[in-house]
C-alpha cells in the first residue's frame, strides 16, 4: 500500500486507479495515506471518476476516511438514492492525515476506466466551527499558516489552557455609601474559569446591608453543595454561602463596615449569575431641631454616621455659638452617634449702641436703648453752628449689623460747622478802623510765632491765611500759636489751637513778589464751633457777582492802626473793591517792580486813603456778604500793600481767594 | 492651616497708645469665625480683650471699652488692636486667636509690650 | 464676672500616672441655649496656650485620647490618664458662657 508523501515534503499530489487512463483490473486493492503538517489538513477532488455502480458501493469503490471516520465511499459516474460518485465535490481531511482505499471486485460487467484525483495540503481555519458546535476561543480567534491562538476582551485574561477567558474580576473596592455590584458580563452569562474577588469597605461605624436583586443563576449541583460555581461572602465576623442555584438569597445584615464577596467558576456552564444592591446604615443622631427664628436643611428622617445639616437663621437674625458669631453652620453626625458640633442660637443682630456723633446727638425712635434689627435711631446736629452733611440722619439697624443711612451709608454723618453767620448787619461806612463787637469776626484768628499774623478759620479744623505770614514756620508747624474765641489780643481768656501742618502754596516764593500768597493751617484738633468760633465760608462759582467794583468787603484784624500800634482790640474796616487796571497803575510807579499786581490778587481801599489794612493784619480775611445765602465769604487774604498803610492814590492788595478754590479743596481733601 | 503673627512695638510709654498688627495666613478673615485679642500678664493671668467678626462688628471685654478699639484690613488680612491711654498695668504678652465653636482655637505665638517712661 | 477657680494650683506627678484638674466657676456657666461653653488650655514655657477641650468634653483636633473633661453646671474636670512628659505645663480652665469671658489663674502639672 503505497504511502505517499509525508511532510515536511511538498504536500501535494496526483492520485489514480491501477491502468488509468485505461480499465482497473479486477480483484485491484490500492491504499494511500497522506500526511500533511500540523495545523493542516488535505484537500482532495477528482478529475476523472468512472467506477462499476454497485448497491451501497460494495462491490467497486473508492474509500475516503480521516483517522477512524470514513469521509466518502464511492462509485458510479453519478450520485443515486443510496450511492455516491464525487462529482464536482472536494474532500477534506479531519486532522492532518487522509486514507484512500481503492478496491475492485471479481469482476465487470463492462469495463471501467476507474479515477484520477488531486490532492494538496492547505491551511486549516480552526476559527471557523460548525453550526452547534463548541468555538474554538472563548473571545477572539485568530488563524494563522499552521495554527491559530486565542485572545481576550479588556478585563480578561486567557487562561491557562489557551482557549478560555478568564475574569479580571479580582481587587475592585467600593467605597460609597451605597452601589450595586454583579457577576461579570450579567445578565448575559457569566465568564468560566474566573475567581472574582470584590470589596466593600466603608468608613468604621457604617454597617453594610446586601441584598441580591433581579435573577440569581450560579451553576449548581442537585446532591453537593455548590461544587462547580459558587458565590461566598466574608465578614470580620462570620461567613455566608456558598451561594449557587436559581433562587435568590435573602438580605444579608452583615453589621460590619468592610465586606468580602468571592466568585468562583469553573470550565462549562452556561449560567447568568448575580447581582447585589447594597446600602449601608449606621448609628443614627439625634434628630437636630432648629433654633427660633432658624430652619435645619437638609430635612430627613434620620441622620447617620456623615450625613450633615446646616442652620439657616431668618433675615435680621444671626447665628451664635454662645456669644461666638459664625457665618455659617454645618454639623456632622459621628460614628458614636453624636454631632460633632453643639447646636447654635439664632439670635436678633444687635447693631450695639450707635456711636457718638461729634457735635451732634442720637435719639431712638423704636424704642429707649432699642438697638436690634430694623430699628431705627436719628442723628441730628447741634443747632444753629452745624448742619449735617450728605445724609438725613435716619439710620437703621440692618441685618449685617450696621447701622446703616436710607443710602447704604454705614459711616456716621457729618455735623459740618456752619460757616459765615456774623453777629453783625452792614452798618455806613466809617473812616478808618472800628471796634469788632463779640461775634462780629467769629471766624477770626490769630497767629503768633515770630510776628503777628491772622487768618481765617475754614470748617473746624482748618485756617486760612497768606503764605508770607507763616512762611518762617512751615517746617515748624507746631511753634505756630493760634488763638481765636476772642476780641482782645493780648486777653488770657481764648481757645488756644495747633497747628499739625502748613500747606504754602506751590507758587508762592518767598521775597519775590506776592503771587500766590496763600497758606493753609491743619489744626491738630476740632474745634467746638459756637458763637464766637465760627468758620467763614469758601466763595461760591456765583461769588463774583458780590465782588465787583465798588463793592464793599470788609477786613478785620489786630495789625497796626492810625497810632502806628498793633491794635488791642480787633479792628475791622469796611472798603470797596478797587478797578483791577487802576490798581495795576498805582503799583507801577517805582518803588514797586512792573507787574506786581497780578490776576491772583485784588484791590480794595479808597482813593482818598485813610481805610486799609495794616502790617499784622496779613493772613487776614477780606469778607464779602453773599446776599443770596445771607452768608458772609472769604474773597481775599491780607497780602501787601504800600509802605504807608492808608495811603491816598494806594490801595490794600488782597490774594483773590477765588482762585484757589481747587487748590484749597484738594489740600483740606487729600489731608 | 490657618496662621496668626502679632506685631509691633515692644515698648510704649505711658498715656500713649499702643498698637499691635495680627496678620493672618491660610484662612480670610472676612470668610468666618471672630477674631481677638487675649493678653497675659507677667505672673500668667490671661485676659480676653475682644473681637472683630467676619462683618467687621466687635465686642470688647467691658472693663477695657473706654480705650480699646479693634479694626481691620480686609486687603491684607489683617486686624488691629488699639488701646489708648496705656499703663504700666498695661505690660503683657499680646496674643491674637481665632474661634470656631471654641474661644480660642488657633493662637499667634504672641508679643511681649512693654509700657514704661 | 464669672470667676473660675482651680485646684490645686500646682500638681507634681510621674510619668504614667493619672492627673485630675478641678475648676469651679462662680455661677452656673449653662449658656440660655443650653451649651455649656466650658473649654481647657495648656501652655507650655515660651509657647502660646493650645486649646485640648471645648464644651466641657470634646476634644480638639489632635489632642491625645488620654485627656477627659467631664463636668456640668459648676464644677468640671479635666483628667489625664497616663501622664506623658509632653504634658508638663500649665493648664487653664475658661468659660465662655457670659461675657466677659474668664479664665482661672492656672494649675501646673510638674514631675514629683
Known amino acids: 500500500t503505497p504511502l505517499g508523501p509525508k511532510w515536511p515534503e511538498p504536500v501535494f499530489g496526483r492520485l489514480a486507479s491501477p491502468g488509468f487512463p485505461g480499465e482497473y483490473a479486477n480483484d485491484q486493492e490500492r491504499r494511500w495515506t497522506l500526511t500533511a503538517p500540523p495545523g493542516y489538513r488535505l484537500r482532495l477532488y477528482f478529475t476523472h471518476f468512472d467506477l462499476e455502480l454497485s448497491h451501497l458501493c460494495e462491490y467497486d469503490f473508492v474509500k475516503l476516511s480521516s483517522g477512524a471516520k470514513v469521509l466518502a465511499t464511492l462509485c458510479g459516474q453519478e450520485s443515486t438514492d443510496t450511492e455516491r460518485a464525487p462529482g464536482k465535490d472536494t474532500f477534506y481531511s479531519l486532522g492532518s492525515s487522509l486514507d484512500i482505499t481503492f478496491r475492485s471486485d471479481y469482476s465487470n460487467e463492462k469495463p471501467f476506466t476507474g479515477f484520477e484525483a488531486f490532492y494538496a495540503a492547505e491551511d486549516i481555519d480552526e476559527c471557523q466551527v460548525a453550526p452547534g458546535e463548541a468555538p474554538t476561543c472563548d473571545h477572539h480567534c485568530h488563524n494563522h499558516l499552521g495554527g491559530f491562538y486565542c485572545s481576550c476582551r479588556a478585563g480578561y485574561v486567557l487562561h491557562r489552557n489557551k482557549r478560555t477567558c478568564s475574569a479580571l474580576c479580582s481587587g475592585q473596592v467600593f467605597t460609597q455609601r451605597s452601589g450595586e455590584l454583579s457577576s461579570p458580563e450579567y445578565p448575559r452569562p457569566y465568564p468560566k474559569l474566573s475567581s472574582c474577588t470584590y470589596s466593600i469597605s466603608l468608613e468604621e461605624g457604617f454597617s453594610v446591608i446586601l441584598d441580591f436583586v433581579e435573577s440569581f443563576d450560579v451553576e449548581t449541583h442537585p446532591e453537593t453543595l455548590c461544587p462547580y460555581d459558587f458565590l461566598k461572602i466574608q465578614t470580620d465576623r462570620e461567613e455566608h454561602g456558598p451561594f449557587c442555584g436559581k433562587t435568590l438569597p435573602h438580605r444579608i445584615e452583615t453589621k460590619s463596615n468592610t465586606v468580602t464577596i468571592t466568585f468562583v467558576t469553573d470550565e462549562s456552564g452556561d449560567h447568568t449569575g448575580w447581582k447585589i444592591h447594597y446600602t449601608s446604615t449606621a448609628q443614627p443622631c439625634p434628630y437636630p431641631m432648629a433654633p427660633p427664628n432658624g430652619h435645619v436643611s437638609p430635612v430627613q428622617a434620620k441622620y447617620i454616621l456623615k450625613d450633615s445639616f446646616s442652620i439657616f437663621c431668618e433675615t435680621g437674625y444671626e447665628l451664635l455659638q454662645g456669644h461666638l458669631p459664625l457665618k455659617s453652620f454645618t454639623a456632622v453626625c459621628q460614628k458614636d452617634g453624636s454631632w460633632d458640633r453643639p447646636m447654635p442660637a439664632c439670635s436678633i443682630v444687635d447693631c450695639g449702641p450707635p456711636d457718638d456723633l461729634p457735635s451732634g446727638r442720637v435719639e431712638y425712635i423704636t424704642g429707649p436703648g432699642v438697638t436690634t434689627y430694623k430699628a431705627v435711631i436719628q442723628y441730628s446736629c447741634e443747632e444753629t453752628f452745624y448742619t449735617m452733611k450728605v445724609n438725613d440722619g435716619k439710620y437703621v439697624c440692618e441685618a449685617d449689623g450696621f447701622w446703616t443711612s436710607s443710602k447704604g451709608e454705614k459711616s456716621l454723618p457729618v455735623c459740618e460747622p456752619v460757616c459765615g453767620l456774623s453777629a453783625r448787619t452792614t452798618g455806613g461806612r466809617i473812616y478808618g478802623g472800628q471796634k469788632a463787637k463779640p461775634g462780629d469776626f467769629p471766624w477770626q484768628v490769630l497767629i503768633l510765632g515770630g510776628t503777628t499774623a491772622a487768618g481765617a478759620l475754614l470748617y473746624d479744623n482748618w485756617v486760612l491765611t497768606a503764605a508770607h505770614a507763616v512762611y518762617e514756620q512751615k517746617h515748624d508747624a507746631s511753634a505756630l500759636d493760634i488763638r481765636m474765641g476772642t476780641l482782645k489780643r493780648l486777653s488770657p481768656h481764648y481757645t488756644q489751637a495747633w497747628s499739625e501742618a502748613v500747606f504754602i502754596h506751590e507758587g508762592y516764593t518767598h521775597d519775590a513778589g506776592f503771587d500766590n500768597d496763600i497758606a493753609l493751617i491743619k489744626l491738630n484738633n476740632k474745634v467746638v464751633i459756637n458763637s464766637n468760633i465760627t468758620p467763614i465760608c469758601l466763595p461760591r462759582k456765583e461769588a463774583e457777582s458780590f465782588m465787583r467794583t465798588d463793592d464793599i468787603g470788609t477786613a478785620s484784624g489786630w495789625g497796626l492802626t492810625q497810632r502806628g500800634f498793633l491794635a488791642r482790640n480787633l479792628m475791622y474796616v469796611d472798603i470797596p473793591i478797587v478797578d483791577h487796571q487802576k490798581c495795576t497803575a498805582a503799583y507801577e510807579k517805582p518803588p514797586y517792580p512792573r507787574g506786581s499786581v497780578t490776576a491772583n490778587m485784588l484791590c480794595a481801599g479808597l482813593e482818598s486813603g485813610g481805610k486799609d489794612s495794616c502790617r499784622g493784619d496779613s493772613g487776614g480775611a477780606l469778607v464779602f456778604l453773599d446776599s443770596e445765602t445771607e452768608r458772609w465769604f472769604v474773597g481775599g487774604i491780607v497780602s501787601w500793600g504800600s509802605m504807608n498803610c492808608g495811603e491816598a492814590g494806594q490801595y490794600g492788595v488782597y490774594t483773590k481767594v477765588i482762585n484757589y478754590i481747587p487748590w484749597i479743596e484738594n489740600i483740606i481733601s487729600d489731608f | 492651616e490657618v496662621q496668626l503673627q502679632e506685631s509691633g512695638p515692644g515698648l510704649v510709654k505711658p498715656s500713649q497708645s499702643l498698637s499691635l498688627t495680627c496678620t493672618v495666613t491660610g484662612f480670610s478673615i472676612t470668610s468666618d469665625y471672630a477674631w481677638h485679642w487675649i493678653r497675659q500678664f507677667p505672673g500668667n493671668k490671661l485676659e480676653w480683650m475682644g473681637f472683630?467678626?467676619?462683618?467687621?462688628?466687635?465686642n470688647y471685654n467691658p472693663s477695657l471699652t473706654s480705650r480699646i478699639s479693634i479694626i481691620r484690613d480686609t486687603s491684607k488680612n489683617q486686624f488691629f488692636l488699639q488701646l489708648n491711654s496705656v499703663t504700666t498695668e498695661d505690660t503683657a504678652t499680646y496674643y491674637c486667636?481665632?474661634?470656631?465653636?471654641?474661644?480660642?482655637?488657633?493662637w499667634g505665638q504672641g508679643t511681649l509690650v512693654t509700657v514704661s517712661a | 464676672n464669672v470667676l473660675m477657680t482651680q485646684s490645686p494650683l500646682s500638681l507634681p506627678v510621674s510619668l504614667g500616672d493619672q492627673a485630675s484638674i478641678s475648676c469651679r466657676s462662680s455661677q452656673s456657666i449653662v449658656h440660655s441655649n443650653g451649651n455649656t461653653y466650658l473649654e481647657w488650655y495648656m501652655q507650655k514655657p515660651g509657647q502660646s496656650p493650645k486649646l485640648l477641650i471645648y464644651?466641657?468634653?470634646k476634644r480638639f483636633s489632635g489632642v491625645p485620647d488620654r485627656f477627659s473633661g467631664s463636668g456640668s453646671g459648676t464644677d468640671f474636670t479635666l483628667k489625664i490618664s497616663r501622664v506623658e512628659a509632653e504634658d508638663l505645663g500649665v493648664y487653664y480652665c475658661f468659660q465662655g458662657s457670659h461675657v466677659p469671658v474668664t479664665f482661672g489663674a492656672g494649675t501646673k502639672l510638674e514631675l514629683k
Open positions: 472683630i467678626n467676619y462683618s467687621g462688628r466687635t
Open positions: 464644651t466641657v468634653s
Open positions: 486667636a481665632r474661634s470656631y465653636d471654641f474661644w480660642f482655637g488657633y
